[in-house]
Amino acid sequence: QSSERRVVAHMPGDIIIGALFSVHHQPTVDKVHERKCGAVREQYGIQRVEAMLHTLERINSDPTLLPNITLGCEIRDSCWHSAVALEQSIEFIRDSLISSEEEEGLVRCVDGSSSSFRSKKPIVGVIGPGSSSVAIQVQNLLQLFNIPQIAYSATSMDLSDKTLFKYFMRVVPSDAQQARAMVDIVKRYNWTYVSAVHTEGNYGESGMEAFKDMSAKEGICIAHSYKIYSNAGEQSFDKLLKKLTSHLPKARVVACFCEGMTVRGLLMAMRRLGLAGEFLLLGSDGWADRYDVTDGYQREAVGGITIKLQSPDVKWFDDYYLKLRPETNHRNPWFQEFWQHRFQCRLEGFPQENSKYNKTCNSSLTLKTHHVQDSKMGFVINAIYSMAYGLHNMQMSLCPGYAGLCDAMKPIDGRKLLESLMKTNFTGVSGDTILFDENGDSPGRYEIMNFKEMGKDYFDYINVGSWDNGELKMDDDEVWSKKSNIIRSVCSEPCEKGQIKVIRKGEVSCCWTCTPCKENEYVFDEYTCKACQLGSWPTDDLTGCDLIPVQYLRWGDPEP
């Protein structure tokens, strides 16, 4: 077992909230069996750990929220992988398995005597994890012990099913909404024939299923649909790309309901195979506006249109985060590892000194350099605040007129907490209202981003539109600069006057050949020619028949 996974970040408190963040990348295919995680992550990992720690500090110093109660946390690393996250969740559960008859914090020995060992406080709820597939696995375990779970980026539609995932809630909308947004974009640009790719796992599979269902209803055809694991090897991505090229030049648009690292895998394959610029990628919020997806592969990503959950940067987080230094940040056990990875240098004399780096870290290094805030930071913070407000409301109803934890609230009953959480309604970190519907979901608001070349070798994401409760707004001029630049992704061009569509056996309805009607036929509908009755002839526009005027021949008329 790899030691990095046993590392836990603790913050003491009267009530402990658990959290699962992807502090490290998921294990590569060859390391899955030993659950050996990948490299440390900044946005999805370290920033989220720090957000949890600092948000709890803010909550604890707010006299109006949970007065006289200190919130603490236990943060574990999910590595964006189900097996690792389950292993870590079992550790959370272990803390919650103290019998309710026992004196809190006292462990009874097998022989009946008391032990002076103080056990850890149980986890009352869990924030995260990020991935839908992982969140489902974790929820399957947590709900057995009535532990509410609030997710900040697990958007799979399956998680809306309260019969299956009773203790699951989220501060983000279900993917059904972004699938709709993606279809609306495809429709807007008359792309009737597109290829489809999704990340294997719940997020990609359920999202793509919704995209396909909605596309079919809108007359959009899928040339072919492919799936791939985010951690698949180069060869798998290369083969997938070669398959996508077989649908060119017709299916130039590739709808990708993908995690960010799947998109990166595709971009890398485009580079290897010499396919930059051949496709326009339409990506879901797994890509959004992440630089870790496009870094080093900007040319391949240019033109990409992505969906991003609406969430402005949180200024106060940056004010806190950018001051952090390895000499003083001791409460985040992954921080030294991250610092060395971020600056590719060695922290000499530190407990976690990494000898693989030759260069020594100098004291002038700062996180301000190339800083990018996690695009889902607002959601992470809102999830933590939701837990706090839920506990606050629970305390108000169970301990009226009492500041702090009253006996009625000890030990915290997960069922009552869930009830309280579902009724939560507060103003989120960005000024928006945070509330949950009957499925524990939040409303859907998205930004539409476009990855563009802004200048020579300078690329960036530009906000080109929004999708809010079913309404798509797009700045077409920003995306295409002129109408003639709009990419075409169609199987067959419309037929000319007097022609009908002939769809070959086994082909999708968007692919046809155009065949002219016979001389005495008119176009009855787009698939059928019909002969005019005797004595009539097709009209000039070939949409019907006109009677042939009767001409009587006289003896002296010239030959026709």
């Epitope: 290369d238 070669k242 077989s246 060119l248 030049p249 580079r271 290897r272 195979l273 396919l275």
Partner: antibody, heavy 115, light 110 residues
Framework: SLEESGGRLVTPGGTLTLTCTVS????????MSWVRQAPGKGLEWIGI?????NTWYANWVKGRFTISKTSTTVDLKMTSPTTEDTATYFC?????????????WGQGTLVTVSS | AFHMTQTPASMEVAVGGTVTMKCQAS??????LNWYQQKPGQPPKLLIY???KLASGVPSRFKGSGSGTEFTLTISGVECADAATYYC????????????FGGGTEVVVK
């Protein structure tokens, strides 16, 4: 069908444009490659123009050749040719919009570089 | 950089015999390997595409096999008309390529 033209005797350092004229082929659906063969030598791939118009070249080309196209022609522009560039130049159609296999070839046009 | 290696450079075979030539890619190309036949004064002609598929009009005595980096072209029941130079070509990538073609194998029929 494909027909190459423009091959002639050229002096080193000049410029030369070879043209591949296509008939019955939609260049917006197929990629086109240029391949050359020096006398008594093997086939050497120069580069490709995809259906999309994007171009790729062999590493050794280093900017000496440029491929472009219209709706009915594919051009190969040679700048500063050397005697090493003496060869028969073929254009060939790829079976796909990008790169896969070359299923249709022209007869070739001979370029001789000599002072 | 990507390159293709063909062996042998030349070989002799008697009419009715069998000939086998090899092609090696510098990195894996799945089954995106094609074989061409070229006779003097003529352009190359596609024989086999995607490692094992016979191009239209090509006799079944030509057989291609292999995947990844190792590929083989076998001609059984060799005829006089098979005297030619055979080239393999990767159809995998156009990026960082020295030559998509192998050096060729000349087949002399006795």
């Amino acid at each position: 069908s494909l027909e190459e033209s423009g091959g002639r005797l050229v002096t080193p350092g000049g410029t030369l444009t070879l043209t591949c004229t296509v008939s019955g082929i939609d260049l917006s659906s197929y990629a086109m490659s240029w391949v050359r063969q020096a006398p008594g030598k093997g086939l050497e791939w120069i580069g490709i123009i995809y259906a999309s118009g994007n171009t790729w070249y062999a590493n050794w080309v280093k900017g000496r050749f440029t491929i472009s196209k219209t709706s009915t022609t594919v051009d190969l522009k040679m700048t500063s040719p050397t005697t090493e560039d003496t060869a028969t130049y073929f254009c060939a159609r790829d079976s796909s919009a990008t790169f896969n296999y070359l299923d249709l070839w022209g007869q070739g046009t001979l370029v001789t570089v000599s002072s | 950089a990507f390159h293709m290696t063909q062996t042998p450079a030349s070989m002799e075979v008697a009419v009715g015999g069998t000939v086998t030539m090899k092609c090696q890619a510098s990195e894996s190309i799945d089954t995106y390997l094609n074989w061409y036949q070229q006779k003097p004064g003529q352009p190359p002609k596609l024989l086999i595409y995607q490692a094992s598929k016979l191009a239209s009009g090509v006799p079944s005595r030509f057989k291609g096999s292999g995947s990844g980096t190792e590929f083989t072209l076998t001609i059984s029941g060799v005829e006089c008309a098979d005297a030619a130079t055979y080239y393999c070509q990767q159809g995998w990538s156009t990026n960082d390529v020295d030559n998509v073609f192998g050096g060729g194998t000349e087949v002399v029929v006795k």
